[in-house]
């Protein structure tokens, strides 16, 4: 490549590589790489790999193009996930089974363990594995609001599909609210979109984690892939803007 | 300002101004400024000023942050508007008045006059002037699809307000469809959001252009502010990438 | 668009996204990032000629504005347009962490 | 953020948005744009020091990355971040036209 003077491509690459070295450490607020001396031998734990893969995969309904980032978003976000409370929990008994809705509840103590302060949360996604779907379906997501009232959050038009597909809903504001409140269990409802004059309001879509009568081994796989909240948050110690170069726990 | 060498701020400003001179002409695909010899004397026509002001004003539901622009969006877009067919037109008689919906129809010949080819359309917004609203209302926008079916487009949660406020819905895809089809009249429906188990589905919001029994002079003002489509499109002659520097009409 | 599809398959001399794969171990001498082993960072490079729109040149330069100086800058510069995040897995002591690093992968460039 | 709020009220030497009002008649010698009479175009200016993260400087430079070289560029550059469109009214012959020009007003800058 040449302009007035020839560009030394190798020098540019070296400068870019050096800049990336600093960029990664700076995003993690590390003054030096963490020592690997105490890393357990063997492959990464299954749960960690699953979490990494969840983060890496773009899913339906997630924007591929990042917005210009606010300053706070420059720094790395720790990724954790909180699985939905299993469907045999008594909380589900309070909500009548209906043809137009499914319910998903989450333990807020688990959320608080992952994100101790609401302000640390930068993104929360509700991820659902939808199984194959024969017809187009318009679904709506609601948040449990008070005793028996639900607040509309968002909607999605699901195209027919022969293969399972992850869906993602941005629920950052809702999870931030939950972290600020004192509740123990909080939840979402996924419903068929009901038009004012339409009669057929059945939820056709099959979400992994709700179908029954499975073979034991299948049920386990099924349970692992049940709805979850994928959380991205600034670790507490990083948020404290420690001037020290410590790698705190 | 200084880096290694002092920056000549005046030179930078001059270069920026010169670049803007070229940028504006280039965005309009003009090789030179248009002659003003035939410009009618006096102020700009009311309708032109109204259109200019509509374009200038940011409205509720419109994103303030531009997306990275595709190449085609570099060039200037001509702005036009097409008013909704007035409510005394017979087309409205076919749709039963209901408490949960209002209907807005548009003449596609007017749309085609403004945008001769679907591909030229870069943005279409449905703009509605909502009058004061006492309670929060969740509304949905539908597109007339076939004889008596409606296709869901989008929704908006309207906060209570003491003053009128313009609402904007992005309906680019829909208008592009209409321009491709042969229909004479096409329309939208604004409805209250109906939950599957909720009973109160009344559309509380009052949209300018639908309320009746007004004093004559008020009705005229009211009619001017009735729902309209704000269209941004590449003018046909600009799209043809003429190499000549002609100012085609 | 000056994206990977166009730039990686052309010999564009002007502003374009250029290929760069970073192998954490080889390029940075790091063994602490467990996943991924490396990533396509890429970078933007190439001139964005400043266009003097002096009257004598109008007709020649107008068509070049879109590519070379769409923002009418006094000194246009080849910079990233679309960026993507990078999730990583690393250990702090005995504890594995998954973190997402924003804006790490350059997908396209622009003159700005 | 390096936006008009911060930059117009500070004496920031590094990358920032700088004030520039374009009066169509005075600055460009144009009388053909009927509305507006001019606009706040603004521009980006100021150095974005390249940060060599050589080992000796680690602790000093890490905090500077966010501002000066967040994209880890080999040659960071001060460019527009947030831009806004400009609608104009002009005549072609006897016919008035309202046109929207995208990305004309610089609201904030960034090192990229």
């Amino acid at each position: 490549l040449s302009t007035c003077k020839t560009i030394d491509m190798e020098l540019v690459k070296r400068k870019r590589i050096e800049a990336i070295r600093g960029q990664i450490l700076s995003k993690l607020r590390l003054a030096s790489p963490p020592s690997q001396g105490e890393v357990p031998p063997g492959p990464l734990p299954e749960a960690v790999l699953a979490l990494y893969n969840s983060t890496r995969d773009r899913v339906a309904g997630e924007s591929a193009e990042p917005e210009p980032e606010p300053e706070a978003d420059y720094y790395a976000k720790e990724v954790t996930r909180v699985l939905m409370v299993e469907t045999h929990n008594e909380i589900y008994d309070k909500f009548k089974q209906s043809t137009h809705s499914i319910y998903m509840f989450f333990n807020t103590s688990e959320l608080r363990e992952a994100v101790p302060e609401p302000v640390l949360l930068s993104r929360a996604e509700l991820r659902l594995l939808r199984l194959k779907l024969k017809v187009e379906q318009h679904v709506e997501l609601y948040q449990k609001y008070s005793n028996n009232s639900w607040r509309y959050l968002s909607n999605r038009l699901l195209a027919p599909s022969d293969s399972p597909e992850w869906l993602s809903f941005d629920v950052t504001g809702v999870v931030r609210q939950w972290l600020s409140r004192g509740g123990e269990i909080e939840g979402f409802r996924l419903s068929a979109h009901c038009s004012c004059d339409s009669r057929d309001n059945t939820l056709q879509v099959d979400i992994n984690g709700f179908t029954t009568g499975r073979r034991g081994d299948l049920a386990t796989i099924h349970g692992m892939n049940r709805p979850f909240l994928l959380l991205m948050a600034t670790p507490l110690e990083r948020a404290q803007h420690l001037q020290s170069s410590r790698h705190r726990r | 300002l200084s880096t290694c060498k002092t920056i000549d701020m005046e030179l930078v400003k001059r270069k920026r101004i010169e670049a803007i001179r070229g940028q504006i002409l280039s965005k309009l695909r003009l090789a030179s400024p248009p002659s003003q010899g035939e410009v009618p004397p006096g102020p700009l026509p009311e309708a032109v000023l109204a259109l200019y002001n509509s374009t200038r004003d940011r409205v509720a539901g419109e994103s303030a942050e531009p997306e990275p622009e595709p190449e085609a969006d570099y060039y200037a877009k001509e702005v036009t508007r097409v008013l909704m067919v007035e409510t005394h037109n017979e087309i409205y008689d076919k749709f039963k008045q209901s408490t949960h919906s209002i209907y807005m129809f548009f003449n596609t010949s007017e749309l085609r006059e403004a945008v001769p080819e679907p591909v030229l359309l870069s943005r279409a917004e449905l703009r509605l002037l909502r009058l004061k609203l006492k309670v929060e209302q969740h509304v949905e926008l539908y597109q007339k699809y076939s004889n008596n079916s409606w296709r869901y487009l989008s929704n908006r949660l309207l906060a209570p307000s003491d003053s009128p406020e313009w609402l904007s819905f992005d309906v680019t895809g829909v208008v592009r469809q209409w321009l491709s089809r042969g229909g004479e009249i096409e329309g939208f429906r604004l409805s209250a959001h109906c939950s599957c188990d909720s009973r109160d589905n009344t559309l509380q919001v009052d949209i300018n252009g639908f309320t009746t029994g007004r004093r004559g002079d008020l009705a005229t003002i009211h009619g001017m502010n009735r729902p309209f489509l704000l269209l941004m499109a590449t003018p046909l002659e600009r799209a043809q990438h003429l190499q000549s520097s002609r100012h085609r009409r | 668009a000056l994206d990977t599809n166009y730039c990686f398959s052309s010999t564009e001399k002007n502003c374009c996204v250029r290929q760069l794969y970073i192998d954490f171990r080889k390029d940075l001498g790091w063994k602490w990032i467990h996943e991924p082993k490396g990533y396509h960072a890429n970078f933007c490079l190439g001139p964005c000629p400043y266009i003097w729109s002096l009257d004598t040149q109008y007709s020649k330069v107008l068509a070049l504005y879109n590519q070379h100086n769409p923002g009418a800058s006094a000194a246009p510069c080849c910079v990233p347009q679309a960026l993507e995040p990078l999730p990583i897995v690393y250990y702090v002591g005995r504890k594995p962490k998954v973190e997402q690093l924003s804006n790490m992968i350059v997908r396209s460039c622009k003159c700005s | 953020a390096l936006d008009t709020n911060y930059c117009f009220s500070s004496t920031e030497k590094n990358c920032c948005v700088r004030q520039l009002y374009i009066d169509f008649r005075k600055d460009l010698g144009w009388k053909w744009i009927h509305e507006p009479k001019g606009y706040h175009a603004n521009f980006c200016l100021g150095p974005c020091p390249y940060i060599w993260s050589l080992d000796t400087q680690y602790s000093k430079v890490l905090a500077l990355y966010n501002q000066h070289n967040p994209g880890a560029s080999a040659a960071p550059c001060c460019v527009p971040q947030a831009l806004e469109p400009l609608p104009i009214v002009y005549y072609v012959g006897r016919k008035p036209k309202v046109e929207q020009l995208s990305n004309m007003i610089v609201r904030s800058c960034k090192c990229s």
Epitope: A31, P34 | - | - | D55
Partner: antibody
Framework: EVQLVQSGAEVKKPGASVKVSCKAS????????MHWVRQAPGQGLEWMGR????????RYAQKFQGRATLTVDTSTSTAYMELSRLRSDDTAVYYC???????????WGQGTLVTVSS | DIQMTQSPSSLSASVGDRVTITCRAS??????LNWYQQKPGKAVKLLIY???VLETGVPSRFSGSGSGTDYTLTISSLQPEDFATYFC?????????FGQGTKLEIK
């Protein structure tokens, strides 16, 4: 100010045991591992082991496995190192040191001289 | 275990001198090399970690360099308070191991 303050010098007979304490202040005790390092007269430094005050997890250098015992009392932010079956070559200055995950000891105690002599 | 060999074991120098101490590891330690200063009756003090990162509060006359197995501590202009014993330590692989130390004395 981050500080580690160790107990005073001890003189022990061979075969006896010694317990050295290390009181931490100025930081969250459970956020860092505590390590123990010793230095025999005129010799270099030798790593003995570490304890994680949060989980109670312990790791010893092979040489001290079975003879050293590391404990913590989180209520008083104190770490302890007990060495049993003392021999004369255990005569040394024993240090507690706070470990940073970057791979270094960033804060050290002042040291406790343990003399093993019959 | 990784062996750390430090040299010289002792060194005489004058105020204002430039002094270099080296440390060699028995295998690649990926820059996880730290330097400490020890004075009689005082707590051990961290000077440099990860080869070249100066600990907060340490004067800039101290610097570190190296990679792979070979590392260096340099004091650019000796000050009276710098006369002490210096140790290197690897933080790459358990068990953590130290060099034998370099005693820096006044000439």
């Amino acid at each position: 100010e981050v500080q580690l303050v160790q107990s005073g010098a001890e003189v022990k007979k061979p075969g006896a045991s010694v317990k050295v304490s290390c009181k931490a202040s100025g930081y969250t005790f459970t956020s860092y591992d505590m390590h123990w390092v010793r230095q025999a007269p005129g010799q270099g430094l030798e790593w003995m082991g570490r304890i994680d005050p949060q989980s109670g997890g312990i790791r010893y250098a092979q040489k001290f496995q079975g003879r050293a015992t590391l404990t913590v009392d989180t209520s008083t932010s104190t770490a302890y190192m007990e060495l049993s079956r003392l021999r004369s070559d255990d005569t040394a200055v024993y240090y507690c040191a706070r470990w940073d995950y970057g791979g270094y000891f960033d804060v050290w105690g002042q040291g406790t001289l343990v003399t093993v002599s019959s | 275990d990784i062996q750390m060999t430090q040299s010289p074991s002792s060194l005489s120098a004058s105020v204002g001198d430039r002094v270099t101490i080296t440390c060699r590891a028995s295998q690649d330690i990926y820059n996880y090399l730290n330097w400490y200063q020890q004075k009689p009756g005082k707590a051990v003090k961290l000077l440099i970690y990860y080869t070249s990162v100066l600990e907060t509060g340490v004067p800039s006359r101290f610097s570190g360099s190296g990679s792979g197995t070979d590392y260096t501590l340099t004091i650019s202009s000796l000050q009276p308070e710098d006369f002490a014993t210096y140790f290197c330590q690897q933080g790459d692989t358990l068990p953590w191991t130290f060099g034998q130390g370099t005693k820096l004395e006044i000439k």
